[in-house]
C-alpha cells in the first residue's frame, strides 16, 4: 500500500500545534511509530524524538481503505528557545519502512512574533505571538 507522512501546524490562542499525519492502510498500523524531532538532520529516531506515538490496529474501523493517524505536539507559548528545524518521521518495526517528512522551521522574530515555514501546500504560517492570531 501507499504510505506517506505530512506535517502541518495550527494555532489556538497562544498554543501552536505541530501535527504529524501518517496515511496508511488499516492493517499497516500495527508496529508503526510516528515521531517528531527537532534539529536532528541525521539521527531522528523515536529514541531522540520530542514525542512519539505508537500506532495500534483499531478493530473498530471497517474496510481496508486508507486511514490517517496523527501525532500532535502542542507548545503552549512559543519562545525563542523553540526556534529550529523540525521533522516528522515514522517507521515500521514489522516491514522496516522508514518515512521522513519535509523539514519545517519555527523562527522567533525580534518583534516577539514567530513564523512556521517549510510546510507543504498553503502551510506557510505567520503568528502574532502577543495577539494570538493568524496574520
Amino acid at each position: 500500500g501507499c504510505i506517506n507522512i505530512t506535517s502541518s501546524a495550527s494555532q489556538e490562542g497562544t498554543r501552536l500545534n505541530l501535527i504529524c499525519t501518517v496515511w496508511h492502510k488499516k492493517e499497516e498500523a500495527e508496529g508503526f511509530v510516528v515521531f517528531l524531532c527537532k534539529d536532528r538532520s541525521g539521527d531522528c529516531s523515536p529514541e531522540t524524538s520530542l514525542k512519539q506515538l505508537r500506532l495500534k490496529r483499531d478493530p473498530g474501523i471497517d474496510g481496508v481503505g486508507e486511514i490517517s493517524s496523527q501525532l500532535m505536539f502542542t507548545i503552549s507559548q512559543v519562545t525563542p528557545l523553540h526556534s529550529g528545524t523540525y521533522q516528522c518521521c515514522a517507521r515500521s518495526q514489522k516491514s522496516g519502512i522508514r518515512l521522513q517528512g519535509h523539514f519545517f522551521s519555527i523562527l522567533f522574530t525580534e518583534t516577539g512574533n514567530y513564523t512556521v515555514t517549510g510546510l507543504k501546500q498553503r502551510q506557510h504560517l505567520e503568528f502574532s505571538h502577543n495577539e494570538g492570531t493568524l496574520s
Partner: antibody, heavy 119, light 107 residues
Framework: EVQLVESGGGLVQPGRSLKLSCAAS????????MAWVRQAPTKGLEWVAS????????YYRDSVKGRFTISRDNAKNTQYLHIDGLRSEDTATYYC????????????WGQGASVTVSS | EIILTQSPTTMTASPGEKVTITCRAS?????MHWYQQKPGASPKPWIY???KLASGVPDRFSGSGSGTSYSLTINNMEAEDAATYYC??????????FGAGTKLELK
C-alpha cells in the same frame, strides 16, 4: 530518573571569575533547553540565563548581560555558567533547571550551587 | 518588563483552613506557573499553565485566573503545605519573571 547536579560554587573574591557546571542525566539532554535561576539569601527566585537545545542561542536577563556566559556540551550532558567580574550582588544559590518543551515552566531543578562573593 | 506582585507576603493558616495566594501581573499574561519551595530545598513546579497540577501535587490545590490576576488555592490546609510559593510567567522580551514569593506558615 532526571538528575541535575551543580558544582563549582564557593567563596570568591569580588572581581574574580567562576564557572558553574550542571551534570544532567535521566533524559535526552540534547533535546531540551536549559536555564540557570538564582536565589540570593532569604530572597526570591530570579531567572539568569537560558540556552537552546543545540547551544547556539543564548538569552540573559539584562542585569547580567556581558558578565555571564551560559553554554552547554551535549556530548558531556553538561551545561555551564561562566561569571566574570563577580560582585557582592551575585551572592546566591544558583540552580540548574530544565525548560519544559511544551510549556514555559521550569520542570526539573538541581540542588543548587552556593556562590558567595566576599573579600 | 512585566512585574509580578504576590500577596500576601507572609500568612499563617490552621489545618483545614482554605488558603488563597494571589499573583498580579503589571500587564496581561497568558499563563501563570506556581512553585513550592521548602527551607533548604530546591523549588518544585506545583501548578503550571494556570490550573494544571504538577505530578504528585495533592488535589486540594488548585489554580485559576486570567489576564493580570491569578491565584493558587489550598482547600484544606495541611501541615505539609507550609512552604514558600512563587508565581512565574514568560513574556517577550524580558523572558522569565518570578513573583517575590508568599511564605505560608502553619498556625
Amino acid at each position: 530518573e532526571v538528575q541535575l547536579v551543580e558544582s563549582g560554587g564557593g567563596l570568591v573574591q569580588p572581581g574574580r571569575s567562576l564557572k558553574l557546571s550542571c551534570a544532567a542525566s535521566g533524559f535526552i539532554f540534547g533535546n531540551y533547553a536549559m536555564a540557570w535561576v538564582r536565589q540570593a539569601p532569604t530572597k526570591g527566585l530570579e531567572w539568569v540565563a537560558s540556552v537552546n537545545s543545540g547551544g547556539g542561542n543564548t538569552y540573559y536577563r539584562d542585569s547580567v548581560k556581558g558578565r555571564f556566559t551560559i553554554s552547554r556540551d551535549n556530548a558531556k550532558n553538561t551545561q555551564y555558567l561562566h561569571i566574570d567580574g563577580l560582585r557582592s550582588e551575585d551572592t546566591a544559590t544558583y540552580y540548574c533547571a530544565t525548560h519544559n518543551y511544551e510549556s514555559t515552566v521550569f520542570d526539573y531543578w538541581g540542588q543548587g550551587a552556593s556562590v558567595t562573593v566576599s573579600s | 518588563e512585566i512585574i509580578l506582585t504576590q500577596s500576601p507576603t507572609t500568612m499563617t493558616a490552621s489545618p483545614g483552613e482554605k488558603v488563597t495566594i494571589t499573583c498580579r501581573a503589571s500587564s496581561s499574561v497568558s499563563y501563570m506557573h506556581w512553585y513550592q519551595q521548602k527551607p533548604g530545598a530546591s523549588p518544585k513546579p506545583w501548578i503550571y499553565e494556570t490550573s494544571k497540577l504538577a505530578s504528585g501535587v495533592p488535589d486540594r490545590f488548585s489554580g485559576s485566573g486570567s489576564g493580570t490576576s491569578y491565584s493558587l488555592t489550598i482547600n484544606n490546609m495541611e501541615a505539609e503545605d507550609a512552604a514558600t510559593y512563587y508565581c512565574q510567567q514568560w513574556n517577550y522580551p524580558s523572558m522569565y519573571t518570578f513573583g517575590a514569593g508568599t511564605k505560608l506558615e502553619l498556625k
